[in-house]
Interface confidence: low
Amino acid sequence: KKVVLGKKGDTVELTCTASQKKSIQFHWKNSNQIKILGNQGSFLTKGPSKLNDRADSRRSLWDQGNFPLIIKNLKIEDSDTYICEVEDQKEEVQLLVFGLTANSDTHLLQGQSLTLTLESPPGSSPSVQCRSPRGKNIQGGKTLSVSQLELQDSGTWTCTVLQNQKKVEFKIDIVVLAFQKASSIVYKKEGEQVEFSFPLAFTVEKLTGSGELWWQAERASSSKSWITFDLKNKEVSVKRVTQDPKLQMGKKLPLHLTLPQALPQYAGSGNLTLALEAKTGKLHQEVNLVVMRATQLQKNLTCEVWGPTSPKLMLSLKLENKEAKVSKREKAVWVLNPEAGMWQCLLSDSGQVLLESNIKVLPTWSTPVQP
């Protein structure tokens, strides 16, 4: 018995061939011997089966001795053995129809789980293998779960259903709702304007929700809400903002915040959360601010950084075009009685300069100039 696999909602064509290459009488019946369709001369006739309006044939092929049964908009319950009667012979074709659907919405938050459920006819024992857009393969039976969805899981998932050495392929588009980066770090000199950007890793026609930036300053004992905002159809409107610092927010996506000045008291870590309408859970992005200050008081030249720096970062003070006078894996370095000239304070990671601040040391009778 020939086995044909079909996909729910698709169209399938079951073949039936006579030895005579001409139009002769044929009938297609189901396993209950109920006539589906056949011919009467050059006319197509239909029987009383439940397939009535979804069954068809190709009259253009009858003259070649081919009498296909076409079933449109397949349903799981169309799975059956179909019998073609032609030239006193019976050809049997077993049709198995499968459906594969995502458990919920195909737009899921990063970290959530995706469950794919296979609908299959009774008596079948299929196996399913799905490949994520990043090339990860997952195997399962009637249900297939992927926990902790990542940004790279966005896109078309390709799932192959195997049954009786035959296979049918499904494509499901999954959108993982997330920020493009889980975390970012901004390095700024004291007094500089700070730009925080929170680009989303997905696009949807209408985006509505609300968000908030909580900030934990390194110098503060507790975190505080710096800004709350609403998002309506991709338009951003600020609901509430602290007076210190007075953040400014862009009116369009990507979410964009401006801190007028980088000051030591602002250095720290923030967590931007975005709650989307009709979604449980929130999107998160961490943002970190590191602030540098170089100062000269009397005979002491000091360079300090505030904020979440990694222990491997190096802080150095050097006179321009000379070797570093002091270099430490610490958050403050200083030089006593610095010689006159342009001094550089450098924060670096494995030799790569992340942040630089210059301070001009004048001969001892003058006061310092900060560029």
Epitope: P133, S154, G155, D173, S184, F202, T203, S350, Q352
Partner: antibody, heavy 118, light 108 residues
Framework: EVQLVESGGGLVQPGGSLRLSCAAS????????VHWVRQPTGKGLEWVST???????YYPGSVKGRFTISRENAKNSLYLQMNSLRAGDTAVYYC????????????WGQGTTVTVSS | EIVLTQSPGTLSLSPGERATLSCRAS???????LAWYQQKPGQAPRLLIF???SRATGIPDRFSGSGSGTDFTLTISRLEPEDFAVYYC?????????FGPGTKVDIK
Amino acid sequence: EVQLVESGGGLVQPGGSLRLSCAASGFTFSNYDVHWVRQPTGKGLEWVSTIGTAGDTYYPGSVKGRFTISRENAKNSLYLQMNSLRAGDTAVYYCARGGYDYYGLDVWGQGTTVTVSS
Amino acid sequence: EIVLTQSPGTLSLSPGERATLSCRASQSVSSTYLAWYQQKPGQAPRLLIFGASSRATGIPDRFSGSGSGTDFTLTISRLEPEDFAVYYCQQYGSSPFTFGPGTKVDIK
């Protein structure tokens, strides 16, 4: 100045091996995804490989199993080990940096030429 | 594999004219993952547009990108002499991260 400099190209016989290097400077290398892209003379661009910040690697079918991408963050270096080379691998090989918070190759090297010929 | 098709293959225009370049994907690509590059002879490519419509740093505002799903467009509002080059689109939506075959914009 943000810069990528490729080296290691040259003439190699079919079936041979070559190791390309890319030296990065002017940015925190470990924070970025990095890529190899090639371009045969007079033809278009072809993506060859990507290595993510977590060391995750990606290849197209044409080089999978023959090429290996790796990175050494301490040395700000990216590598491409190419084995079982074919004439079809002849091209200018560029290393490129992936955008920090977006998808796009925002910094490119000047390229190094690989010729596979007997 | 997502196949990107660029059209036209060559676009012959005069300085000051508007150029419209098309990039069509064989399957839907999130606009987040679509980028455009410019390449001049003997040079490495240069990123123009990321996220289908965001200009990269230092790119003049005569360059703009648009589109979603399977159809994307790069527009150069008024061609300057330095804009005559080959333009490629690239998708990151699914590995392999394919490039389009390119559109050459040359002087009429």
